[in-house]
């Protein structure tokens, strides 16, 4: 068990330990350095969901040692359009590959200051952080 | 600022306050009671991403007052296959609509017990919790 929030000592325990312990231990996929329009703009017939999708994507690591979780992964679309279901390799201009975003709650570690202004360990500041979760194949918007 | 974890008093502050404060304030969408194969098995030409997707989905609320965050939303696919990019209104069996899962870090509130076994407030237990984020149109797996 970790304990319910109140101020932490600055000696590094349990804050340092918990910061490490709260990261997502395994990335959704090993991040790959693949570019838009690369050879990966195809839908595989095996492998993980993000490579079999007709809106394929890769994951990009976003690491911040002063944030909890320290490691976040952002989806990056590999194609502007969707990949054809017919062949798995040609693009279909009738569909767009769009990022799905989510505002995730994260905590940033900030120095705490006591009443006299002296350093009193570390506190957490809660923020909403926009993360791209996946790429989704959508029909283009029709402008009214 | 909230403070870095250590044990909390059981009187409800700051634990109760923080539990509420840490929930995601706005759901991704108002959850709807739509069934598989319903009229919603179509890709809209406007509206949010989950209704324009050719693997459309709805969100289902998962609320637990003893969990942080209290409110999580699970994606539920509206179609077994993908919706045709040509029409947006009929299914294309060459593609499957599959759930994308993510193991999210959550914290459960549990009673803390002191060295003598007496109730010492509330502690947090960290767990990985599987959440479905979206539905993705994929090429079916080819079994080797």
């Amino acid at each position: 068990y970790s304990h319910w929030p109140s101020c932490c000592p600055s000696k590094g325990y349990p804050s340092e330990e918990l910061l490490r312990w709260s990261t997502v231990p395994v990335p959704p996929l090993k991040p790959a350095s693949l570019d838009f329009h690369s050879v990966s703009c195809r839908a595989s017939e095996d492998g993980p969901l993000n490579s079999r999708a007709i809106s394929p994507w890769r994951y990009e690591l976003d690491r911040d040692l002063n944030r909890l979780p320290q490691d976040l992964y952002h989806a990056r679309c590999l194609c502007p359009h969707c990949v054809s279901l017919q062949t798995g390799s040609h693009m279909d201009p009738r569909g767009n590959s769009e990022l799905l975003y989510h505002n995730q709650t994260v905590f940033y570690r900030r120095p705490c200051h006591g009443k006299k202004g002296n350093h009193k360990g570390y506190c957490l500041e809660r923020r909403l952080y926009r993360v791209s979760l996946a790429c989704v194949c959508v029909r283009p918007r029709v402008m009214g | 600022y909230s403070h870095w974890p250590s044990c909390c008093p059981s009187k409800g502050y700051p634990s109760e306050e923080l539990l509420r404060w840490s929930t995601v304030p706005v759901p991704p969408l108002k959850p709807a009671s739509l069934d598989f194969h319903s009229v919603s098995c179509r890709a809209s030409e406007d509206g949010p991403l989950n209704s324009r997707a050719i693997s459309p989905w709805r969100y289902e609320l998962d609320r637990d007052l003893n969990r942080l965050p209290q409110d999580l939303y699970h994606a539920r696919c509206l179609c077994p296959h993908c919706v045709s990019l040509q029409t947006g209104s009929h299914m294309d069996p060459r593609g499957n609509s599959e759930l994308l899962y993510h193991n999210q870090t959550v914290f459960y509130r549990r009673p803390c017990h002191g060295k003598k076994g007496n109730h010492k407030g509330y502690c947090l237990e960290r767990r990985l919790y599987r959440v479905s984020l979206a539905c993705v149109c994929v090429r079916p797996r080819v079994m080797g």
Partner: antibody, heavy 121, light 113 residues
Framework: QVQLQESGPGLVKPSETLSLTCTVS????????WSWIRQAPGKGLEWIGF???????NYNPSLKSRVTISVDTSKNQFSLKLNSVTAADTAVYYC???????????????WGQGTLVTVSS | DIVMTQSPASLAVSLGERATINCKSS????????????LAWYQQKPGQPPNLLIY???TRDSGVPDRFSGSGSGADFTLTISSLQAEDVAVYYC?????????FGQGTKVEIK
Amino acid sequence: QVQLQESGPGLVKPSETLSLTCTVSGGSISSYFWSWIRQAPGKGLEWIGFIDYSGSTNYNPSLKSRVTISVDTSKNQFSLKLNSVTAADTAVYYCARQEIINFELNWFDPWGQGTLVTVSS
Amino acid sequence: DIVMTQSPASLAVSLGERATINCKSSQSVLYSSNNKNYLAWYQQKPGQPPNLLIYWSSTRDSGVPDRFSGSGSGADFTLTISSLQAEDVAVYYCQQYFSTPWTFGQGTKVEIK
């Protein structure tokens, strides 16, 4: 050989609902998509919408708010309802079949003979 | 929506001469997966429904005389009547079935000069 025949009133009052039926003979209504198309006097062709045997519909966005297409597989018929009509809805209304090949819809063939609907008080 | 634009609006050709009708789409109707153009041509004679002539931009329907031919790809298409006959007097329409809503050109009226 599949044949299509439109039927319904030839005169409809403004603000009322236009109702037409297309009867399919010489073949089953299943396995195909069925469209309504109209042509105002001296004008071009405008697609209204389609339906399949399961009742899945798709409408032209320009008419979507006023159109309902339904199917009755037991009678081998599909129907069109267009509400709140005005003089601009005066047209020859055609029904037509669309084949589905490789999970995609194709050209219109065959067509019904068409029925003239006049909107007038 | 994909807008289909035909030219000319009307055409007068002598019997036995060539008639050429153009059709432009506001976006490509070529699907690279199967290398097909999702475009059809119809002939409509007075008082009759349209009749399918050509599909996939260049494939003649069964029973259509070989004087009718379709060509083009992407967004530019042509219907050619190589030797105009009296029975070819009609209005000709192009139509895309690449994506809904299905749309037609405004029509080209072919007459005898």
